[in-house]
């Protein structure tokens, strides 16, 4: 199977880490999201929105 | 702010076993790479191996696969390692660290091992 | 598994004065997300290491500048631009591109 971290899905730098069960981002310091998309804030929050219905903001994201 | 918080120091007997925890506190371990790392006294650091909760996957370095079971509870924030069959080459600290930045470390469990 | 050498492993230095540490690694630390991570940790005397530069050049928050990473591929260098008295300790190169996860044996950076 192809590497599906060979496509960078993850933003700022982000670590992609692939699995049977699909890929996550391990963000770089400063960022946080599913893909690292979002800067982190100062005050320690954040500009992230509401995850997608039926994806919580931890779960691997599965790749086909 | 999320901290890594260690467990207390353990003294223990040559042949035994230690567990040493790792919790998040003010955060989640999610999808990074809880590593533990051993620094004997006056000697360098040591990559024991990690874990990436998310997925429930430990990865060990070769000198440590037979004797270190790494775990993780996503419940409750906490990853745990396990080291069986001590000797006394095995007092040192240990260390949990969240890679791949290395940007956390816990503050070092001391563990004694001695008769 | 990926093989860290850092040299030299001793460096007295004179306070103010640059110092300079090189890591190489056995093989290419590029992963296959195109980032590479080579972190650069800073261990204290009786305390934890602490990050100071991550992924070869970017330093992480609260180190001061005077620390800088540079390199690429398997050759990488932190300088101190110039030596203070907190400076000294111990510093390590280390990779997680690769399970393992490896360190250098680390460089001793003393005072003069």
């Known amino acids: 199977r192809a590497d599906p971290c060979a496509a960078r899905p993850c933003a700022h730098g982000g670590r992609c880490y692939a699995h049977f069960s699909g890929l996550v981002c391990a963000c770089a310091p400063g960022y946080m999201g599913a893909r690292c998309e979002f800067p982190v804030h100062p005050d320690g929050a954040s500009a992230l929105p509401a995850a997608p219905p039926g994806l919580r903001p931890g779960d691997p994201q599965r790749y086909l | 702010q999320v901290q890594l918080v260690q467990s207390g120091a353990e003294v223990k007997k040559p042949g035994s076993s230690v567990k040493v925890s790792c919790k998040a506190s003010?955060?989640?371990?999610?999808?990074?790479?809880i590593s533990w790392v051993r620094q004997a006294p006056g000697q360098g650091l040591e990559w024991m191996g990690g874990i990436i909760p998310i997925f429930g996957t430990a990865n060990y370095a070769q000198k440590f696969q037979d004797r270190v079971t790494i775990t993780a509870d996503k419940s409750t924030n906490t990853a745990y390692m396990e080291l069986t069959s001590l000797t006394s080459e095995d007092t040192a600290v240990y260390y949990c660290a969240r890679d791949p930045f290395s940007d956390l470390w816990g503050r070092g469990t001391m563990v004694t091992v001695s008769s | 598994d990926i093989v860290m050498t850092q040299s030299p492993l001793s460096s007295p230095v004179t306070l103010g004065q640059p110092a300079s540490i090189s890591c190489r690694s056995s093989q290419s630390l590029v992963h296959s997300d195109g980032n590479t991570y080579l972190n650069w940790l800073q261990q204290r005397p009786g305390q934890p290491p602490r990050l100071l530069i991550y992924?070869?050049?970017n330093p992480f928050s609260g180190v001061p500048d005077r620390f800088s990473g540079s390199g690429a591929g398997t050759d990488f260098t932190l300088k101190i631009s110039r030596v203070e008295a907190e400076d000294v300790g111990v510093y390590y190169c280390?990779?997680?591109?690769?399970?393992?996860?490896?360190f250098g044996p680390g460089t001793k950076v003393e005072i003069k």
């Open positions: 003010g955060g989640t371990l999610s999808s990074y790479v």
């Open positions: 280390m990779q997680a591109t690769q399970f393992p996860h490896t």
């Open positions: 992924q070869i050049s």
